[in-house]
């Protein structure tokens, strides 16, 4: 299973649920569906309040139980380490795949943390991070921000990912803006 890791803002905007949590248990495989679930302890929720309603405590995260069908495999054995998890809700359950944004909270830049806690949501409705994977690439809309990290640095963990958000400048226009300057 292969997929291009998204810009964190794209991950935030395209997810139903974005939380901070600790993985606290060994995965259990459902012997019927071949899905596995990880027990988690949620510490913060950044997106999904309305989608979840009253059931605002997520205790498990679900993923296919095999790599070939894009299952997520959690490698860290540190049960006190917090992770940012951006996933989809299916029948009220949090689902993730290899392609989901799952990262140690401590590995995120201060700007990314600011984005997840406050700023990315501002760009969700109007703006789109547009991946530039090969030259030439051009903006297809004024609301697009060209994401060139992979092209220029060969990594999704480049400057735009770690420090910028695609935010409205004026109606019909979005631009890359620094998250660093917005950190209190």
């Amino acid at each position: 299973c292969t997929c291009v890791p998204p810009h964190p803002q794209t991950a935030f905007c395209n997810s139903d649920l974005v939380i901070r949590a600790k993985f606290v248990g060994t995965p259990e495989v459902n012997q019927t569906t071949l899905y596995q679930r990880y027990e988690i302890k949620m510490t913060k929720m950044y997106k999904g309040f309305q989608a979840l309603g009253d059931a605002a405590d997520i205790r498990f995260v679900y993923t296919p139980a095999m790599e070939s069908v894009c299952g997520y495999f959690h490698r860290s054995h540190n049960r006190s380490e917090e992770f940012l998890i951006a996933g989809k809700l299916q029948d009220g359950l949090l689902h993730i795949t290899t392609c989901s944004f799952v990262a140690p909270w401590n590995s995120l830049s201060l700007a990314q943390r600011r984005g997840f806690t406050k700023t990315y949501t501002v760009g969700c409705e109007e703006c789109t991070v547009f991946p530039c994977l090969s030259i030439p690439c051009k903006l297809q809309s004024g609301t697009h921000c060209l994401w060139t990290d992979q092209l220029l640095q060969g990594s999704e963990k480049g400057f735009q990912s770690r420090h910028l958000a695609c935010l409205p400048r004026e109606p019909g226009l979005c631009t890359w803006q620094s998250l660093r300057s917005q950190i209190a």
Partner: antibody, heavy 113, light 111 residues
């Protein structure tokens, strides 16, 4: 009691086809993923293929991918393995197994000219 | 293509205890509590002796026990008896291959 009975094995020429069946009883068949495991003469065990309870997800070992097809009929409590383009190295006893626990007695497949 | 490592052979005298190890990785033995052990007598189908690391199916003697530490699982047979002489295979759920096996261990009961 829980029982799995394989059938359909036999002698087949290289390049030929064979369809194995596994009749299940004593448990709710559709509630379990099922798999096929094989054992070549004098060798160890090798996982071949698996299928989810609904039949919606299938998985294959690299050695059989593209040649073997696993399927199931939950209304008949039966698991199948369609084996095409058979090779000499596919010669083995084929076992049907429930998820990771109960096994059948096996059926011998011999690929030889 | 053996994914789990077992000793090729072990032996013990009647009444003794023996332990068979099964070493894998974090994506199989170490990552899941789904390790099974099978006993296979010549010409017979494998018989489940231990499942989910340490659980015994009904009808299996309590002389058989299983455990796991990190990426290594173990099968211990206490009070060894002549009928325990057989091949033993470990099996684990695996994130990449669904199901992986050890190469098998031939248990010889001496005397």
């Amino acid at each position: 009691q829980v029982q799995l009975v394989e059938s359909g094995g036999g002698l087949v020429q290289p390049g030929g086809s064979l369809r194995l069946s596994c009749a299940a009883s004593g448990f709710t068949f559709s509630s379990y993923a099922m798999s096929w495991v094989r054992q070549a003469p004098g060798k160890g065990l090798e996982w071949v293929s698996a299928i989810s309870g609904s039949g919606g997800s299938t998985y294959y070992a690299d050695s059989v991918k593209g040649r073997f097809t696993i399927s199931r009929d939950n209304s008949k409590n039966t698991l199948y393995l369609q084996m095409n383009s058979l090779r000499a190295e596919d010669t083995a006893v084929y076992y049907c197994a429930r998820f990771l626990d109960i096994w059948g007695q096996g059926t011998l497949v011999t690929v030889s000219s | 293509d053996i994914a789990l490592t077992q000793p090729a052979s072990v032996s013990g005298s009647p009444g003794q205890s023996i332990t068979i190890s099964c070493t894998g990785t974090s994506s199989d033995v170490g990552g899941y509590n789904y390790v099974s052990w099978y006993q296979q007598h010549p010409g017979k189908a494998p018989k489940l002796m231990i499942y989910d690391v340490s659980n015994r199916p009904s009808g299996v003697s309590n002389r058989f026990s299983g455990s796991k530490s990190g990426n290594t699982a173990s099968l211990t047979i206490s009070g060894l008896q002549a009928e325990d002489e057989a091949d033993y295979y470990c099996q684990s759920y695996d994130f990449y291959k669904f199901n992986v096996f050890g190469g098998g261990t031939k248990l010889t009961v001496l005397g």
